[in-house]
């Protein structure tokens, strides 16, 4: 049976230094002894879930297996459950700790909610920063540019350090960072524009920090279903975040009578949240949840950890799937709105725009939808995966690339109705956004699968990275500029307008068809990966002599 | 040597119409952006409206006074900025300068770093 | 819309004195305020953007000041040629707006 006092403790925050200290004394002597960092005295991360006897491990995925045993010759643990017992030990009720850990999640994906709110705030009054500093098009296109740009910099950097320091510290003190920035960057005069691009940076380096950093500790604290659940929570944050951003961008702004007022309001959220997290989140260890030794913290190099994620066929093409899903979300986004506005030119429905912003209501209703569909994308791909690992060990990879072969369908259908119906374009925007964003929480979870937590941090960071370099940083210049190419072999008129930027469109589909094979290709991939890196982790529950990775 | 040299102007019935225009020359007119400002006799200055460049979809602003009367329009590759007035009242009598906003690529200002001579229009019947 | 109140409307004084001219905003506005000089029968011209940076070509002895609601415009030792109207101009917000003008005229 698995030791219940350790999966409680496991669960449990950080205690007094002099408790920890004297069970780590405690666990070097079991160690010695074992041959297997027992569960005895396990601090907030928990032992490796060993039980008095010495039998038994929980893995990734929550299971129970037989424990390694330590090296010839070796007694077992017949002092492992009077230690457990022992003064030094404490055993707080499950019930407590599960409330605990659901606090940690709730803040964790607040902060991720403030996240996005801060990003899509900027999105939200940035017609109004472009007449304030006389921005150009292709000034608001260098904003852009330089947060995705420090955001996928910075990325890695955290993933390095997420995976070797004390991360509540480096999430908190990066939500304090962007909150600072973003705050400042409200009392920015005209004449310096390249500051707000700096302040731009800067916030992407900050937020860089959050999005590479959370999802590993919500890793850490929970297994199976329940995880797929938190990390649903989490990602669906995405959504609602944006929507709040832009809700709040334009309300705080009519409201103030001032845009500058709207970039006051998630900082401090920012600072009250970042406090909250120093307090409420526990400082985890890393494989926290799959019951692993206080010992557990990253030792390889860097280097080593890129070759491992390069050589994990899973999370090579779960990450190339994912790239395909920021493509098509990145050039959707910019370009759907302009698209049905000149559907409806067309459909003589609408006036030519000559004075922008066009689209202005096609943007709030897409942007609604965007909103809508990523809650319940979210929403129907956990529970199609809870549904579906009852029927197959490869049910992850296998819902997000129906997911995606599904939604490339009725992307492509956008084009098709739009010509004739609106309200048609938007049914088949909205089925294929559900669709296209019922993979984010799965991809993060097939990530906790297939990669040990020590190198979580810095996956989370390639990831981020690989799908914003292929992604959503080139796909709506691409998308402009082979438009623009069409319209030039082509004679000027408002139907051209709209079929060169229909016809560049249709690249989406094409791109969100390849994401989907990726998936399909994760699924031959992903039980063997998920068995090697389980074997790994009952690796790093042994003494640091026999460990490799 | 940048140059701004406005023509047009005239005498004109009360709800008639009249275009004025502005020849430039001296700097890159197609990223700059320009405005017409207008001074009534013994007067201050007063905006009257602006028109961006191409990077910012030629998009034009104007004062309330104006709005719904006036129309700003660019040829760029004329190197012209236009002022198009309809139903012209009384006290649209003025002097009109064509100006240019400095600019810096990514962005421009909206201070007038250059004027025109100035066009007189009277508008009396 | 943001309305500029240039003081006093006109300002008397004579060659070699110091003077300021003030423009006040009915809300704040940071530093974006420009100066214009406007001799007689002429088209204005540039002096300083942003409340205190002078263009290229001014004379040193045209400085700006100020930030928020209120802007000065500082003229060291007046010459001859700076009797003219100066005009403030905002460019916080559209619609863009000038102040009434200040006239310099010789004591």
């Known amino acids: 049976m698995m030791c219940l006092e350790c999966a409680s403790a496991a669960a449990g925050g950080a205690e007094e230094e002099e408790a920890d200290a004297e069970r780590r004394r405690r666990r070097r002597g079991a160690q010695r002894g074992a041959g297997g960092s027992g569960c005895c005295g396990a601090r907030g991360a928990g032992g490796a879930g060993v039980s008095a006897a010495g039998d038994e491990v929980q893995t990734l995925s929550g299971s129970v297996r037989r424990a390694p045993t330590g090296p010839p010759g070796t007694p077992g643990t017949p002092g492992c459950a009077a230690t457990a017992k022992g003064p030094g030990a404490q055993q707080p009720k499950p019930a407590s700790l599960g409330r605990g850990r659901g606090a940690a999640a709730a803040i964790l994906s607040l902060g991720n909610v403030l996240n996005y709110l801060d990003r899509y705030t900027v999105a939200g009054v940035l017609l109004d920063i472009q007449q304030h500093f006389g921005v150009k098009d292709r000034g608001a296109g260098l904003l852009q540019s330089v947060f995705i740009c420090s955001f996928m910099v910075a990325a890695p950097i955290f993933g390095y350090l997420g995976d070797r320091f004390n991360r509540k510290v480096i999430l908190s003190c990066g939500i304090f960072f962007w909150s600072a920035v973003t705050f400042s960057s409200s009392f920015i005069p005209q004449q310096y524009f390249w500051l707000l691009v700096l302040s731009r940076g800067l916030v992407g380096i900050g937020e860089a920090s959050y999005s590479t950093i959370a999802p590993t500790i919500i890793g850490d604290l929970f297994t199976k279903n329940t995880r797929t659940l938190m990390l649903s929570v989490f990602y669906f944050a995405i959504p609602l975040g944006s929507g709040l951003g832009y809700i709040t961008g334009s309300s705080v702004k009519q409201a103030a009578g001032d845009w500058h007022w709207a970039l006051r309001v998630s900082p401090v959220l920012g600072m009250i949240t970042g406090t909250l997290i120093l307090i409420l989140v526990p400082a985890t260890k890393r494989g926290h949840a799959d019951q692993l030794g206080d010992q557990l913290k990253a030792r390889t190099s860097w280097l080593r950890d890129m070759k491992a994620l390069i050589r994990n066929r899973s999370y090579v093409f779960s990450s190339l799937a994912t790239s395909a899903v920021s493509f098509a979300t990145g050039a959707l986004g910019m370009w759907i709105p302009l698209y049905l506005h000149r559907a409806q030119v067309v459909q003589k429905t609408a006036e030519t725009c000559n004075s922008p912003p066009c689209g202005a209501k096609d943007s709030l209703i897409f942007g609604a939808i965007t909103c809508f569909t990523g809650f319940l994308g979210v929403v129907t791909g956990a529970g199609a995966t809870r549904w579906c690992r009852l029927k197959t060990q490869r049910a992850d990879p296998l819902v997000c690339a129906v997911g995606m072969l599904g939604s490339a369908i009725f992307i492509c259908l956008i084009f098709v109705a739009a010509k004739s119906s609106i309200v048609g374009a938007y049914i088949c925007i909205f089925v294929g956004e559900t669709l296209l964003f019922s993979n984010w929480a799965i991809t993060a979870d097939i990530l906790m699968y297939v990669v040990i937590p020590t190198r979580r941090a810095t996956a989370v960071a390639l990831q981020s990275f690989t799908s914003h370099l292929l992604g959503d940083a080139g796909s709506p210049y691409l998308i402009g500029f082979i438009s623009d190419l069409i319209r030039q072999s082509t004679k000027d008129s408002p139907l051209w307008e709209f079929l060169s930027l229909g016809y560049a469109l249709m690249l989406c589909p094409f791109v969100v068809v390849l994401g989907g094979m990726f998936f399909l290709a994760t699924a031959l991939f992903f039980v063997s990966d998920r068995a090697r890196a389980e074997q790994q982790v009952n690796q790093l529950a042994m003494p640091p002599a026999s460990v490799k990775v | 040597e940048v140059q701004l040299v406005e023509t047009g102007g005239g005498l004109v019935q009360p709800g008639s119409s009249l275009k004025l225009s502005c020849s430039t020359s001296g700097f890159t007119f197609s990223e700059t952006w320009m405005s017409w400002v207008r001074q009534a006799p013994g007067k201050g200055l007063e905006w009257v409206g602006l028109?961006?460049?191409?990077?910012?979809?030629?998009?034009?602003n104007y004062a309330e006074s104006v709005k719904g009367r006036f129309t700003i329009s660019r040829d760029d590759s004329k190197r012209r900025v236009y002022l198009q007035m309809y139903t012209l009242r009384d006290q649209d009598t003025a002097t009109y300068y064509c100006t240019s906003h400095e600019d810096f690529y990514y962005y421009s200002s909206y201070y007038f770093d250059y004027w025109g001579q100035g066009v007189m229009v009277t508008v009396s019947s | 819309d943001i309305v500029l109140t240039q003081s006093p409307a006109t300002l008397s004084v004579t060659p070699g004195e110091s003077v300021s001219l003030s423009c006040r905003a009915s809300q704040g506005i940071s530093t974006s305020i420009h100066w214009y000089q406007q001799k007689s029968n002429e088209s204005p011209r540039l002096l300083i953007k942003y409340a205190s940076q002078s263009m290229s070509g001014i004379p040193s002895r045209f400085s700006g000041s100020g930030s928020g609601t209120d802007f000065t415009l500082r003229i060291n030792r007046v010459e001859s040629e700076d009797f003219s109207v100066y005009y403030c101009q905002q460019s916080y917000n559209l619609p863009l707006t000038f102040g009434s003008g200040t006239k310099l005229e010789i004591k």
């Open positions: 028109i961006k460049d191409k990077n910012s979809n030629y998009e034009a």
